[in-house]
């Protein structure tokens, strides 16, 4: 239904708190360098304007689109060109081109310092003084670093943050209460960010059809008792919600997500028996809970997939009649039978099935041709299963840090031209898959591992797009999203790479490393490891282990020494010499 004033409609639907939070996120994701105070001022102006429109929908400018209203606000910021360069050119365009232009200027890797958490006492003081401003800062800092973060989910994480602070700031030992809880929220939020970025990439590069296929597979796994029409409706709605969020239409996105949650809770009987606990929660928690609800129990009497998709005489006729519907039905039927497969794998199987029908239905005797299609799925299924087994075995043997190092070596050999910080970030993230997935029950490992790796590799591709340096990476990133992970896995040592010359300063360390937090120490060591591989791409695992053990021993010794500086300056050069010899 059309509303006279879009902004009044969204303000009424969302309520002031969520409205303000979403507008702040939107501005922070578009203009990532502006301070919190600059954005907070704009948010207040937009909110005051929205209230005038609620009071009188016919008031001046209330009939303007949200893009026009928000774009005009952003373009009125002083010194836009000085701070944002060519992004200011967007302001010369009309809607919808202006918004598209803003979207294209979103930076996935903004040059902002890491978000440092203040110490507990200071955090609690500022939280108690002004909880609204405190949470505003949180939304601003996360949104500007993650310009595609799923906005309604970010409101959920802010709510979690709020609850943790409310609880822990009342404790005597605030630090030990806050740290593990906030670390947990941070880890979940970072995973949420890369997953959502993958969805937006899917939408941007391959369109709504690709995203909808992803949604059909995912929803069919989760709700195997829902019929195809129900799954299609949910997938269509979910696609709309994600399209809006990826497109910067955050108010519409949050509003439609709330509607979808409401619909699911009102139609539990035809969707799933597992929704009630989620549906009892307040809005943000409800929508979050629904997004990760456990799989419903699979119907016991499902016929073999072959009946309708291989043995049925009408396969090619059904395919001819309505390709997308027939392939969608195949994806639905296959996915609801396989909660143990990754969505990426299910989409690869659907793609293989489609290619088989395209080829076979054109032949003189199609059934003889497509009769073996299910058998041809076997290698596609075995490949990720082997990946999971091999990597989880390695993780169990080495632990998270050792596993990250193994991945770092592997990926540096595959793409040595990629910058060391990007390789280290990617390897650390890819290595977390062990902790995240390898501890799960057998039937949950594959979906967890492959879909998480796909999301991390999507970030690698986005960063590489900005400065393409490796043909290997370009090749894997150019194909379809579901083929990326197998493509990266299949890469071997890049034979075209000319090894980096050995620079002693790259491996020279100072006593300040001793006081770094453990995570930062690990990053320093991993940076050195990547540089070693770039120097000797064909070094054996044994050679690299020798060097890294020596390095760890050196750090341990010097950091325990009475005169750390002297130890580093005398033992450092000896370490460098031993490294060169070990790799010779």
């Amino acid at each position: 239904e059309a509303h006279k004033s879009e902004i009044a409609h969204r303000y009424n639907d969302l309520g002031e708190q969520h409205f303000k939070g979403l507008v702040l996120i939107a501005f922070s994701q578009y203009l990532q360098k502006c301070s919190y105070d600059e954005h907070a001022k704009l948010v207040q102006e937009v909110t005051d304007f929205a209230k005038t429109c609620v009071a009188d929908e016919s008031a001046a400018n209330c009939d303007k689109s949200l893009h026009t209203l928000f774009g005009d606000k952003l373009c009125a910021i002083p010194n836009l060109r000085e701070n944002y360069g060519e992004l200011a050119d967007c302001c010369t365009k009309q809607e919808p081109e202006r918004n598209e232009c803003f979207l294209q200027h979103k930076d996935d890797n903004p040059s902002l310092p890491p978000f440092e958490r203040p110490e507990a006492e200071a955090m609690c003081t500022s939280f108690k003084e002004n909880p609204t401003t405190f949470m505003g800062h949180y939304l601003h800092e996360v949104a500007r670093r993650h310009p595609y973060f799923y906005a309604p989910e970010l409101l959920y994480y802010a709510e979690q943050y709020n609850e943790i602070l409310t609880q822990c700031c009342a404790e005597a030992d605030k630090e030990s209460c806050l740290t593990p809880k906030l670390d947990g929220v941070k880890e979940k939020a970072l995973v949420s960010s890369v997953r959502q970025r993958m969805k937006c990439s899917s939408m941007q590069k391959f369109g709504e059809r690709a995203f909808k296929a992803w949604a059909v597979a995912r929803l069919s796994q989760t709700f195997p008792n829902a019929d195809f029409a129900e799954i299609t409706k949910l997938a269509t709605d979910l696609t709309k919600v994600n399209k809006e969020c990826c497109h910067g239409d955050l108010l519409e996105c949050a509003d439609d997500r709330a509607e979808l949650a409401k619909y699911m809770c009102e139609n539990q009987a035809t969707i799933s028996s597992k929704l009630q606990t989620c549906c009892d929660k307040p809005l943000l928690k409800k929508a979050h809970c629904l997004s990760e609800v456990e799989h419903d129990t699979m119907p016991a009497d499902l016929p073999a997939i072959a009946a309708d998709f291989v043995e049925d005489q009408e396969v090619c006729k059904n395919y001819a009649e309505a390709k997308d519907v027939f392939l969608g039905t195949f994806l639905y039927e296959y996915s609801r039978r396989h909660p143990d497969y990754s969505v990426s794998l299910l989409l690869r199987l659907a793609k293989k099935y489609e290619a088989t029908l395209e080829k076979c239905c054109a032949e003189a005797n199609p059934p003889a041709c497509y009769g073996t299609v299910l058998a041809e799925f076997q290698p596609l299924v075995e490949e990720p299963k082997n990946l999971v087994k091999t990597n989880c075995d390695l993780y169990e043997k080495l632990g998270e840090y050792g596993f990250q190092n193994a991945i770092l070596v592997r990926y540096t050999q595959k793409a040595p031209q990629v910058s060391t910080p990007t390789l280290v970030e990617a390897a650390r993230n890819l290595g977390r898959v062990g902790t995240k997935c390898c501890t799960l029950p057998e039937d949950q490992r594959l979906p967890c591992v492959e879909d998480y790796l796909s999301a991390i590799l999507n970030r690698v591709c986005l960063l590489h797009e900005k400065t393409p340096v490796s043909e290997h990476v370009t090749k894997c990133c150019s194909g379809s999203l579901v083929e990326r992970r197998p493509c990266f896995s299949a890469l071997t040592v890049d034979e075209t790479y000319v090894p980096k010359e050995f620079k002693a300063e790259t491996f020279t360390f100072h006593s300040d490393i001793c006081t770094l937090p453990e995570k930062e120490k690990q990053i320093k060591k991993q940076t050195a490891l990547a540089e070693l591989v770039k120097h000797k791409p064909k070094a054996t695992a044994e050679q690299l282990k020798t060097v890294m053990d020596d390095f760890a021993q050196f750090l341990d010794t010097c950091c325990k020494a009475a005169d750390k500086d002297t130890c580093f300056s005398t033992e450092g050069p000896n370490l460098v010499t031993r490294c060169k010899d070990a790799l010779a």
Epitope: E314, V315, C316, K317, C361, A362, E363, A364, P367, A368
Partner: nanobody, 115 residues
């Protein structure tokens, strides 16, 4: 909606000829292999002949090999079956189907071979 309309049947003496046509609509005809099947009174459906989407590959049941010729005109969305040297045992309702299906979709066209 997929539609297949067969025509060209009739009564013919043994040794005579007929040319059946099948007009297709509702799908991309040029991308699908097509088939002729037949059903004699009181019998099951029998596969007669198949042709690939481009018309570059054809197959025939042993019982009609050398007598029947399947062809297609993708520009006209039409499938043909040229039947020569007809025999009484060729008497049946003939149907065209998509992609090797043995499930008759259209009305079919009656072919009767009798002296």
């Amino acid at each position: 909606q997929v539609q297949l309309q067969e025509s060209g049947g009739g009564l013919v003496q043994p040794g005579g000829s007929l040319r059946l046509s099948c007009e297709a609509s509702g799908f991309t005809f040029s991308r699908f292999g097509m088939t002729w099947v037949r059903q004699a009174p009181g019998k099951g459906v029998e596969w007669v002949s198949g042709i690939s989407s481009l018309g570059d590959s054809t197959l025939y049941a042993d019982s009609v090999k050398g007598r029947f010729t399947i062809s297609r005109d993708n520009a006209k969305n039409t499938l043909y079956l040229q039947m020569n040297s007809l025999k009484p045992e060729d008497t049946a309702v003939y149907y065209c189907t998509i992609g090797g299906s043995l499930n008759p979709g259209g009305q079919g066209t009656q072919v009767t071979v009798s002296s």
